[in-house]
Amino acid sequence: PPNRRTCVFFEAPGVQGSTKTLGELLDTGPELPRAIRCLYSRCCFGIWNLTQDRAQVEMQGCRDSDEPGCESLHCDPSPRAHPSPGSTLFTCSCGTDFCNANYSHLPPPGSPGTPGSQGPQAAPGESIWMAL
């Protein structure tokens, strides 16, 4: 049977707004990723900032509702915005536990979902796990 959706929770210092109210934080140990049980959806999200081929996690948590993309099993980010020259925000939504912890690849900033990404790559069969 399904459990309530559980996602990795992270908010970089200085990030505007908080998604903490969209779930209940689990009491995890200091070495473990923070986890949040979603209150209003069965969907996780992740936001990464790609600057000069270096990806930095900005936010991870629960979405406020189930939307297109939430049926995805994995986090497949697509470019969303250019907060400053040379940096691109990538976001993903996905619908399995802790699916927002990692991404398998980032597509090139100019073309959403295009194969042959120029972004940070993981070897085939591996994933890049964001260090929290």
Epitope: P1, P2, L39, D97
Partner: antibody
């Protein structure tokens, strides 16, 4: 097919610890929570908590906080539940389950002086 | 903690007859994601519990269609349309909406 095989019965003295193992097969171990439930003799079922093997995140019943540790070894697809400072009322059959759908056969832990 | 109250606690039934078990929760089990984390288990004598129903009304794989679940909010029912000998045991309702997850006290079904 999905199978969960638990370690054998244990007899412990009050104040001691017990570690029950649960070896999973027939599915991707890291994709499902492992739940732990216990049942005292002639009594009902009591939820102890659960752990997600991929990252060791766990969610406990507050009643057992500080006394219970749940861990997993993904290389052997085995989950462990350790209960410390045992008391006579911890005498029970301890079950592991794959996110509550497939259950192990149970491990009887007897606490007696 | 959410208290799950089952009735009756003992249920003698004639083979081939229907049976019904009620489960009431002290708080609503509908979660914010609009899913209700209510399950039913059968524990046959000397065996491990076995999942019958999840999400109020979804039969788990391999569970005969004579078992059905219904209800919402705080009021839930498990029905067996025609009781068979293999249905003997203790039935538990369980909620996974609120922490800690909790079981009902069990309903013992026996053949008259």
């Amino acid at each position: 097919q999905v199978q969960l095989v638990q370690s054998g019965a244990e007899v412990k003295k009050p104040g001691a610890s017990v570690k029950v193992s649960c070896k999973a097969s027939g599915y991707t171990f890291t994709d499902y929570w492992v739940s732990w439930v216990r049942q005292a003799p002639g009594q009902g079922l009591e939820w102890m908590g659960e752990i997600y093997p991929k990252n060791q995140v766990s969610n406990f019943n507050e009643k057992f906080k500080g006394r219970v540790t749940m861990t997993t070894d993904t290389s052997t697809s085995t989950a462990y539940m350790e209960l410390r400072s045992l008391r006579s009322d911890d005498t029970a059959v301890y079950y592991c389950a794959r996110q509550r759908d497939y259950w192990g056969q149970g491990t009887l832990v007897t606490v007696s002086s | 903690d959410v208290v799950m109250t089952q009735s009756p606690l003992s249920l003698p039934v004639t083979l081939g007859q229907p049976a019904s078990i009620s489960c009431r929760s002290s708080q609503s089990l509908e979660y914010g994601d609009r899913y209700t984390y209510l399950e039913w288990y059968l524990q046959r004598p000397g065996q491990s519990p076995r999942l019958l129903i999840y999400g109020v009304s979804n039969r788990f794989s391999g569970v005969p269609d004579r078992f059905s679940g219904s209800g919402s909010g705080t009021d839930f029912t498990l029905k067996i349309s025609r009781v068979e000998a293999e249905d003997v045991g203790v039935y538990y309702c369980f909620q996974a909406t609120h922490d800690p997850n909790t079981f009902g006290q069990g309903t013992k079904l026996e053949i008259k």
